[in-house]
Interface confidence: low
């Protein structure tokens, strides 16, 4: 495989002339500072660019914002700062884009020292803005109701919860002393409140409330709450125990009307829970280990969110920075990548292809040698750099990248050895969802997936010199063309392409320095003149996902079904196009014991696929006996893995056992935990539980 133009990449030669005719430069005549970009709508070509420049002077910060708008995917920008009355916009709140294709935009102004604030709103994709005065100062970005973009929710710096039903024109205060608020489905809002001093002081003694009618009525659905979160169809709350300062997870699937205790270990003050990923079927939950270890355990849930199976030990998740490498590979169903912290304190990458059922190391790329971390130079694995490496300021410009419509493609920085290395990484690609890997580019790069995977682009990371080259590939990274997009190099800051990876345009952002000032500059390259032909049926080939043994009748079966995809041939140079839809053909597999997890009170002995009754219950199983609901204590020992669609085959039905008799203990059975229980709060301080898929963390 070549990383430069060569004989094998002859199809990419002569691209310069075609690309030069569709390369567009825009100079932003303002002080550099920072820039935030937002695409408004899908396929509209509208981009808003907000540049901010701040200078601290004595006790205050003086700032300047400029707003630019593009209607052609960034090829040209118009200065529309006048639409926001030259107001300084809070860059920490970013540009709040409305859901779906609503065309709505909110910009929050920085009105220092006042008791209120101001927002600028647009309903026409940023063509025009009107300003609205707020009767409060927002604490975080205003959030849209996912189903009705006219309805907005805001939390103020005085912990008040505010709602607008007319896109910010009028606001009503819903509640005081609010710590955290989230939209549920329909018009439901969940929020926690404190009674005494503050969110921090009352941590573990918070109340969880719900309104299902936009604040006309309220219901307490939980007390003694430490934190809460939503994941898929599950509502989670961490609830303080009566007897000590530990807390444990309770789960609801009916918006908080009824709660069940999750069969997970309880945690102490210095530990935390975190939802790593969730969908309507199941949840990945991280439970922090006691002590400042930097790791914990991943558990995967059943379809009720109640019974959990241990999925991965020593999962890296630092308590200090809140960093984990857990990554959902969106280009192939069931695939997740993360890091573990081994006994010798080195970091290793693990991958699962079956939604956490089994984890393995990444296969060594055939075109790579094992590095100095490897004890055996012939046997080693690929290790991927993700959030943690970036937080440690390693030379890793980007996290792993995958897109749902670029089937099977995963791009990531990594090193090949026994563990992640602090040496300068290279870029690796997988075209089969992580089963096999190839070194794609030498050294660190910024990269993007365009045209649903039909086009990849990359820019070499060069902190000390300017950049004037972009690399591009039409064959999933096997061959790379190089295009010099400018004579005068720029200090490159990042690649930007429209979310969804359907565009043929990519923008390179950076700045130039003159003797007296720096200014932002963007180059937008449209590859449509290079790849002119639309793809036809002959350009696609059938690919069976998760295929590891073509001889096996059950080859490709993951979670009870296999999928065949139509994928673009590597040799085809054509446009998938904006309207490209992933074509897949699912087929149901026969059930085997692998399609079932062991229910509460059962376990799988090593190297056995049968679920065996536990001789005695101990640890958090016994706690589940004490606090769990009675209907969850009857079982036949097996439950179908969430999302598993297998039919026929093995049907592990056996007599239903009542486990209640196993739950006898000399503990006094406490009252059932429910949303109305009373009692003094245990503990305060400690770490927040991070109940956000995508790791969007809430900090007090």
């Amino acid at each position: 495989r070549s990383t430069e133009q060569g004989e094998s990449c002859s199809g990419l030669l002569g691209a310069d002339a075609k690309l030069a005719g569709n390369t567009h430069q825009h100079i932003f005549n303002d002080l550099s500072g920072s820039v935030s970009l937002a695409w408004v709508g899908d396929g509209t070509g509208v981009i808003l660019a907000l540049t901010t420049f701040q200078v601290p002077i004595f006790m205050i910060t003086i700032g300047q914002s400029k707003l630019y708008r593009s209607e052609d995917y960034g090829k040209s920008f118009e200065d529309v700062t006048n639409l926001i009355n030259n107001t300084f916009i809070r860059s920490d709140f970013g540009i709040a884009i409305g859901p779906e294709n609503s065309g709505k935009v909110i910009l929050t102004a920085d009105v220092s020292g006042s008791h209120g604030s101001r927002i600028f709103v647009s309903s026409d994709f940023g063509k025009s803005f009107t300003h609205q005065e707020l009767p409060f100062v927002p604490l975080m970005q205003i959030t849209y109701n996912p189903e009705n973009s006219n309805v907005l929710l805001a939390l103020s710096n005085k912990n008040e919860l505010w709602l607008s039903e007319d896109f910010g024109t009028n606001w009503k205060k819903l509640y005081d002393a609010v710590c955290l608020a989230k939209w549920g489905s329909d018009n439901t809002i969940f929020f926690t409140t404190y009674a005494n001093g503050s969110c921090k002081a009352d941590l573990g003694a918070l109340e969880l409330w719900r309104t299902s009618d936009l604040g006309k009525s309220f219901k307490t659905i939980g007390v003694k709450i430490y934190s809460f979160g939503l994941g898929g169809r599950f509502l989670f709350a961490s609830v303080m125990a009566d007897k000590d300062t530990t807390r444990r997870i309770h789960v609801s699937t009916d918006q908080g009307d009824t709660w069940s205790m999750a069969q997970l270990p309880s945690v102490g003050q210095e530990q935390f829970y975190s939802i790593l990923a969730a969908n309507d079927d199941m949840v990945f939950m991280h439970v922090d280990e006691p002590g400042d270890t930097g790791f914990g355990t991943i558990f995967t849930s059943d379809d009720r969110g109640i019974v959990y199976s241990k999925s991965l030990d020593r999962h890296l998740y630092t308590t200090t920075g809140g960093e984990t490498d857990f990554t959902n590979v969106t280009s192939l169903r069931g695939v997740y990548i993360t890091s573990v912290l081994s006994e010798d304190n080195s970091i290793q990458t693990m991958i699962t292809f079956d939604q956490g059922g089994r984890w393995t190391h990444l296969r060594k790329p055939e075109n790579s040698e094992c590095d100095a971390t490897a004890k055996n130079k012939n046997e080693c694995s690929l290790h991927i750099h993700a959030s943690y490496s970036i937080s440690q300021k390693l030379n890793v410009p980007m996290a792993p990248l995958s897109e749902p419509n670029a089937v099977g493609i995963v791009i990531a920085h990594g090193s090949v050895g026994d563990a992640i290395s602090v040496m300068v990484p290279d870029v690796y690609i997988s075209d089969d969802g992580g089963y096999s890997w190839t070194k794609m580019l030498e050294g660190p790069h910024h990269y993007a997936i365009l045209d649903s995977g039909g086009l990849l682009v990359a820019v070499e990371q060069n902190a000390h010199q300017g950049v004037n080259q972009i690399k591009f590939s039409t064959d999933e990274g096997q061959c790379w063309g190089v295009y010099n997009f400018t004579k005068d190099p720029i200090f490159f800051t990042g690649l930007a392409s429209e979310p969804g990876a359907r565009s043929m345009n990519v923008s390179l952002w950076g700045y130039r320095s003159s003797l007296f000032h720096q200014y932002w500059i963007s180059f937008t390259i449209d590859f449509r003149d290079l790849i002119t032909r639309n793809c036809e049926e002959k350009d696609y080939t059938i690919w069976l996902a998760h295929s590891t043994d073509p001889e096996d009748y059950e080859d490709g079966c993951i979670l009870g079904y296999k999928e065949q995809f139509l994928r673009l041939r590597k040799s085809s140079v054509c446009q998938n196009g904006r309207d490209y839809v992933v074509t897949k053909q699912p087929s149901i597999c026969l059930c085997s014991l692998e399609d079932f997890l062991c229910d509460f009170g059962y376990y799988r002995p090593e190297n056995d696929s049968k679920c065996v009754e536990q001789p005695e219950l101990k640890g958090h199983d016994l706690e589940f006996c004490l606090y769990g609901r009675e209907e969850h204590l009857t079982t036949n020992g097996y439950r179908k893995i969430p999302g598993d669609k297998c039919q026929g085959g093995v049907n592990p039905v056996r007599e239903v056992k009542d486990l209640k008799k196993k739950c006898t203990s000399n503990f006094l059975s406490p009252e059932k935990q429910n949303s109305k229980s009373n009692g003094s709060a245990g503990g305060s301080g400690g770490l927040n539980d991070i109940f956000e898929a995508q790791k969007i963390e809430w900090h007090e």
Partner: antibody
Framework: EVQLLESGGGLVQPGGSLRLSCAAS????????MNWVRQAPGKGLEWVSA????????YYADSVKGRFTISRDNSKNTLYLQMSSLRAEDTAVYYC??????????????WGQGTTVTVSS | EIVLTQSPGTLSLSPGERATLSCRAS???????LAWYQQKPGQAPRLLIY???SRATGIPDRFSGSGSGTDFTLTISRLEPEDFAVYYC??????????FGQGTKLEIK
């Protein structure tokens, strides 16, 4: 400016005790593992003890295990080394150092000026 | 226990010359976990290189580190008067948590 300042050294008899302190400034103390490293007169460097950012995990060299205790007070940005049952071979300059990151090792990037401990009768 | 042996014990060179200091481990050490320090008389050590080859903040580019497995090298491409000092290699990650080499004294010829 990132700084570490040791104190508490001095002359002590064999079998005696001493408590060293290290005041940190210029960085978020609780985010970093901290170490004590010592250097006997005319000799090389020897690692003594380490403690994680929260204080939840502690580590010791075999030569001091059971006699020395490392601790920290993150509210005061201070690291401590409680030394007991001191021996003549514990005589050294004791340095407080800052470590870096879980999983990666970026060296001990900040060192104090050292405090001298002399164990003699 | 991993033992680090540095050689030579003393190296006599003149300013402007190239210095090559060696550190050998008794068993394989991950290059991610090897560091070099400089110590001048009466001063605390200073981190030069971590991860076998990454320069610490503020360290001039005449200092470079290389090596893997059991053999590591610190090179000073062109000696300056202020470079004459004692140099220590250090490994991390096994028991004991850290071990230092015995040091190489770099002196003016």
């Amino acid at each position: 400016e990132v700084q570490l300042l040791e104190s508490g050294g001095g002359l002590v008899q064999p079998g005696g005790s001493l408590r060293l302190s290290c005041a940190a400034s210029g960085f978020t103390f609780s985010s970093y593992a901290m170490n004590w490293v010592r250097q006997a007169p005319g000799k090389g460097l020897e690692w003594v003890s380490a403690i994680s950012g929260s204080g939840g995990s502690t580590y010791y060299a075999d030569s001091v295990k059971g006699r020395f205790t490392i601790s920290r007070d993150n509210s005061k940005n201070t690291l401590y080394l409680q030394m007991s049952s001191l021996r003549a071979e514990d005589t050294a300059v004791y340095y407080c150092t800052r470590g870096r990151g879980i999983g990666y090792y970026n060296g001990m990037d900040v060192w104090g000026q050292g405090t001298t401990v002399t164990v003699s009768s | 226990e991993i033992v680090l042996t540095q050689s030579p014990g003393t190296l006599s060179l003149s300013p402007g010359e190239r210095a090559t200091l060696s550190c050998r481990a008794s068993q394989s050490v991950s290059s991610s976990y090897l560091a070099w320090y400089q110590q001048k008389p009466g001063q605390a050590p200073r981190l030069l290189i971590y991860g076998a080859s990454s320069r610490a903040t503020g360290i001039p580019d005449r200092f470079s580190g290389s090596g893997s497995g059991t053999d590591f090298t610190l090179t000073i491409s062109r000696l300056e008067p202020e470079d004459f000092a004692v140099y220590y290699c250090q490994q991390y990650g096994s028991s004991p948590m850290y071990t230092f080499g015995q040091g190489t004294k770099l002196e003016i010829k």
